[in-house]
Interface confidence: low
């Protein structure tokens, strides 16, 4: 069986001071001893805890230790459970408070001949007694004008008079100990017929339009007199305003209205008051018009990272004084940490790229708020994502050196060909990201290249050789199209390089050798007597070990070439009449022809009337006119050449026959008649 | 010390696989190119491969596709992974730093055997 | 690629002689040229940098010269120490290739 050797008792306690509740179990086996308080288990705390199996109190608290504990032994294998006597604390205690205004209820109630009544908020167990003091004089019951109630803690005044007036303050005493108030109270009676002052007054500031209000209050026995006078010294009442007052209304518990405030009513209101007896009491209070200004714009800023910086807002002019504050994502900056508000000013330390943005001052005031948006920019140095490489790029095709860095803000890429700055050009194109392209690499390009890329922060860069690979060309490349004269001699070239010489070698494009009297001599293609059968597609190809070979199609044609078989002649005509330019070519292909009169060819589907050209080439021109007059240009061409030839032609007045003449004596030269 | 250190040679049979290692100290390690260079005991000098700052790599023709260059920065570490190993590539394989267009600075080497 | 060719592949010769080793490259590498000194069991030590420039540290008894293929390295006055296997290499384009290297013996 459990058996308690020791249990807890009741005992008197101190508010704050140790205390301990024993209790001491003997059992056959092993117990496990917990508390109730209440019937509520209770729980160890650094003030409350079991000590061995009594229950230790570090400081007795009057509110959490009030109730009934109990030792509760359990033997945790039989289940058998036993419980101690129940013991509490009488706790003492002693807690200091104001003295405060119980009767009436509030100080502006507190007049002559009133019964005023005091509490003194001192509070313990036992209760304690009470004592009170004026002015630090002890008071003892039973004096005149007032009565103590130590049950209720109160001093009474009946009738309060001015004699009243002073600091009253209280001390208790108990069994526990002795304390004072903690906050003591002004009782102030004066003489009723001097005014006094109750409501004053306060400086306002107001946005236009709006409404502005002054309170002002006196109190005298009897009732004193108030008047509003405006700067001039002119009194406002509600049957005499000043013109600039109009919208002014006194209300009859003093206060002023003032509504649609506008500039010309701010300035020094004074509310007088005099009493039946005693000086005139005179108040003063100033009307502001709020007003803020625009804020000045901020610059962009670019800042270095780990540098510290700062950015001042200066505040604009405002009544009242504007508040200012910083914004970063729409979050306001704290007055500490690394990114914080100082005064007006925005300070960034150890600055880290994180730290851009756009950050704001805002400015507030009654008359609006005003907001300016600076933008940080945090510049690092550039880093490499690619640095240019030495190259080897191929003539005539496009060439890239990459220089790819990244920082902020972007960075300024400038690349130098030998040390000398490359202005964008034709050939030259510098992309966004910083690589260089060469549109059309050239074998003088292979050279030095080096690239800079630049912030505020700093600057890096890196160089890479060029080595310009030639490539296997043509030089020139043969015309496509080329014409042999029908039984004459003839060559058609073919060259080209490569960075090995290349070998060069003709053949038909059909695949099939030339014939005997057709020779290949180093890329020279020789036709000892073109024959009709020469005519054709042919292939010359050039080749080399390194690149491979390239071809260059060419389509022979053989022809006769052209040969006038009639010429135009040197013709004069009559005004009016007809003349006939007659022109006749030959060869193969059949030659077409063409007329150009006076430097410009003349178009068979826009002759007009007058011209026409004949299937055979020759050109008629009817009625001809002075201005018909000049060069005409015959011009004969098939698709392996051209040749041209011309002749004048006048046109004169016809001249008015003479007797002596005959019909038959001809013209000084040939004419042509119609 | 600005050193280069070597390590993961060894022997290994033909087609087989090993990965050298290049451990950098003493020096801004990220701000160099860096190459392996081999030598065939007793015989001359040949370079392997080579990377960039950037990671831009380089590689022979007798090598390439089947050797793999790479960097680790933060490790300060060089590597050259070797696949399909012939016995043509038996050698002390150095790893080297390469500025200004010459090799500055040179480890001590690590011996490579590929035999059956 | 660019072959480098050595000459000699081997030389004998006696401390205080004047040696000159010869590099010829198969293309035109302008002054892209380095050699290296390679003493046994040793690891090749840079001794001359862009045809002529000397590397910090390396006696002035060594010195080089040429520029396009055609280079030579000269020991003024061989001392003990020089006995070594000596390389060139070209840098001018990747791949980056050695000579055959050249063994300079005690006589």
């Known amino acids: 069986a459990i058996v308690f050797i020791k249990q807890p008792s009741s005992q008197d306690a101190l508010q704050g001071r140790r205390a301990l509740l024993r209790c001491e179990v003997e059992a056959p086996g092993p117990v496990h001893v917990y508390w109730l308080l209440d019937g509520a288990p209770v729980q160890d705390t650094e003030r409350r805890f079991a000590q061995g199996s009594s229950l230790s109190f570090a400081a007795v608290d009057r509110l959490q230790d009030s109730g009934t504990f109990q030792c509760v032994a359990r033997d945790d294998v039989t289940g058998e459970e036993a419980r101690s006597a129940n013991a509490s604390f009488n706790i003492k205690w002693i807690e200091a408070g104001p003295v405060v205004l119980k009767h009436p209820a509030s100080e502006a109630e507190i007049q002559p001949q009133t019964q005023v009544t005091l509490r003194c908020h001192i509070d313990g167990h036992p209760r304690p007694t009470y004592q009170w003091f004026r002015d630090g004089t002890p008071l003892s019951d039973g004096q005149s004008n007032h009565t103590v109630s130590s049950k209720e803690r109160n001093l009474t005044l009946r009738p309060a008079g001015p004699e009243h007036s002073g600091l009253y303050s209280c001390c208790a005493h108990s069994a526990f100990g002795q304390a004072c108030s903690s906050q003591n109270f002004t009782l102030s009676i004066a003489d009723e017929s001097f005014a006094r002052v109750v409501l004053a007054p306060q400086d306002v500031v107001v946005a236009r339009y709006e409404e502005a209000m002054f309170h002002c209050q006196f109190s005298a026995q009897p009732p004193p007199s108030l008047q509003w006078l405006f700067e001039d010294e002119t009194p406002i009442t509600n049957r005499s305003r000043p013109p600039h007052l109009r919208r002014a209304t006194v209300f009859a518990n003093g206060s002023l209205l003032l509504t649609q405030v506008r500039p010309r009513n701010a300035g020094i209101y004074r509310c007088i008051g005099q009493g039946q007896r005693g000086p005139p009491i005179i108040l003063e209070a100033t009307l502001h018009l709020a007003e803020i200004e625009d804020m000045p714009l901020f610059e962009p800023r670019v800042f270095t990272a780990g540098s510290e910086e700062r950015v001042t807002c200066l505040p604009p002019k405002g009544l009242p004084e504007p508040s200012v504050w910083w914004e970063h994502a729409g979050v306001r900056l704290p007055t500490h940490g690394r990114v914080y508000q100082k005064g007006h000013e925005l300070v960034l330390a150890n600055i880290a790229e994180s730290d851009a943005g756009v950050y704001t001052c805002h400015a507030a005031n009654l008359a609006g708020q005003r907001r300016q948006d600076v933008n940080i920019t945090v510049a690092t140095v550039p880093s490499w994502l690619k640095k240019p490489q030495d190259s080897q790029l191929e003539e005539g095709k496009p060439g890239y050196l990459d220089c790819l860095t990244q920082a902020t803000p972007k960075p300024t890429v400038v690349w130098y060909r030998n040390q000398m700055l490359i202005s964008e050009d034709s050939r030259f194109e510098v992309f966004k990201n910083g690589t260089l392209r060469i549109n059309s690499v050239e074998v003088y390009d292979g050279t030095w290249y080096r690239c800079m890329s630049s912030t505020p922060a700093g600057s890096i860069e890196a160089q890479a050789r060029v080595q310009v690979l030639e490539k296997l060309k043509f030089t020139p490349p043969p015309q496509p199209q080329q014409c042999m004269e029908f039984d004459k001699e003839a060559t058609v070239p073919c060259s080209a390089t490569g960075r090995e010489k290349p070998t060069i070698k003709w053949e038909r494009a059909d695949g099939s050798s030339l014939p005997e009297w057709v020779t290949d001599n180093a890329g020279t293609l020789h036709f000892a007597r073109v024959t009709r059968d020469d005519a054709g597609n042919y292939t010359c190809i050039a080749s080399n070990g390194p690149q491979g070979q390239i071809r260059a199609h060419v389509q022979l044609t053989v022809a006769v070439f052209i040969t006038f078989k009639v010429e135009p002649e040197r013709t004069t005509v009559y005004q009016g009449h007809t003349a006939l330019l007659q022109c006749e070519a030959q060869g193969d292909p059949k030659p077409l022809i063409q007329w150009k009169g006076k430097d410009r060819i003349l178009d068979p589907t826009k002759l007009g009337p007058r011209m026409h050209i004949f299937q055979n080439g020759s050109l008629v021109i009817h009625d001809v006119a002075p201005e018909d007059s000049g060069r005409y240009t015959c011009i004969a061409g098939n698709s392996c050449n051209i040749k041209h030839t011309e002749a004048p032609l006048y046109v004169v007045d016809k001249p008015v026959p003479e007797e002596s003449e005959g019909p038959g004596s001809p013209p000084p030269y040939k004419m042509i008649q119609t | 010390e600005v050193q280069l250190v070597e390590s993961g040679g060894g022997l290994v049979q033909p087609g087989g696989s090993l990965r050298l290692s290049c451990a950098a100290s003493g020096f801004t390690f990220s701000s160099y190119d860096m190459h392996w260079v081999r030598q065939p005991t007793g015989k001359g000098l040949e370079w392997v491969s080579s990377?960039?700052?950037?990671?831009?790599?380089n590689y022979p023709g007798s090598v390439k596709g089947r050797f793999t260059i790479s960097r680790e920065n933060a490790k300060n570490s060089l590597y050259l992974q070797m696949n399909s190993l012939r016995a043509g590539d038996t050698a002390v394989y150095y790893c080297?730093?390469?500025?200004?267009?010459?090799?500055?600075?040179w480890g001590r080497g690590t011996l490579v055997t590929v035999s059956s | 690629d660019i072959q480098m060719t050595q000459s000699p592949s081997s030389l004998s010769a006696s401390v205080g002689d004047r040696v000159t080793i010869t590099c010829r490259a198969s293309q035109s590498i302008s002054n892209f040229l380095n050699w290296y000194q390679q003493r046994p069991g040793k690891v090749p030590k840079l001794l001359i940098n862009a045809a002529s420039s000397l590397q910090s540290g390396v006696p002035s008894r060594f010195s080089g010269r040429g520029s396009g293929t055609d280079f030579t390295l000269t020991i003024g006055s061989l001392q003990p120490e020089d006995f070594a296997t000596y390389y060139c290499?070209?840098?001018?384009?990747?791949?980056?290739?050695f000579g055959g290297g050249t063994k300079v013996e005690i006589k």
């Open positions: 080297a730093r390469w500025v200004n267009w010459y090799f500055g600075l």
């Open positions: 290499q070209q840098s001018y384009i990747t791949p980056l290739t």
């Open positions: 990377i960039g700052t950037a990671g831009n790599t």
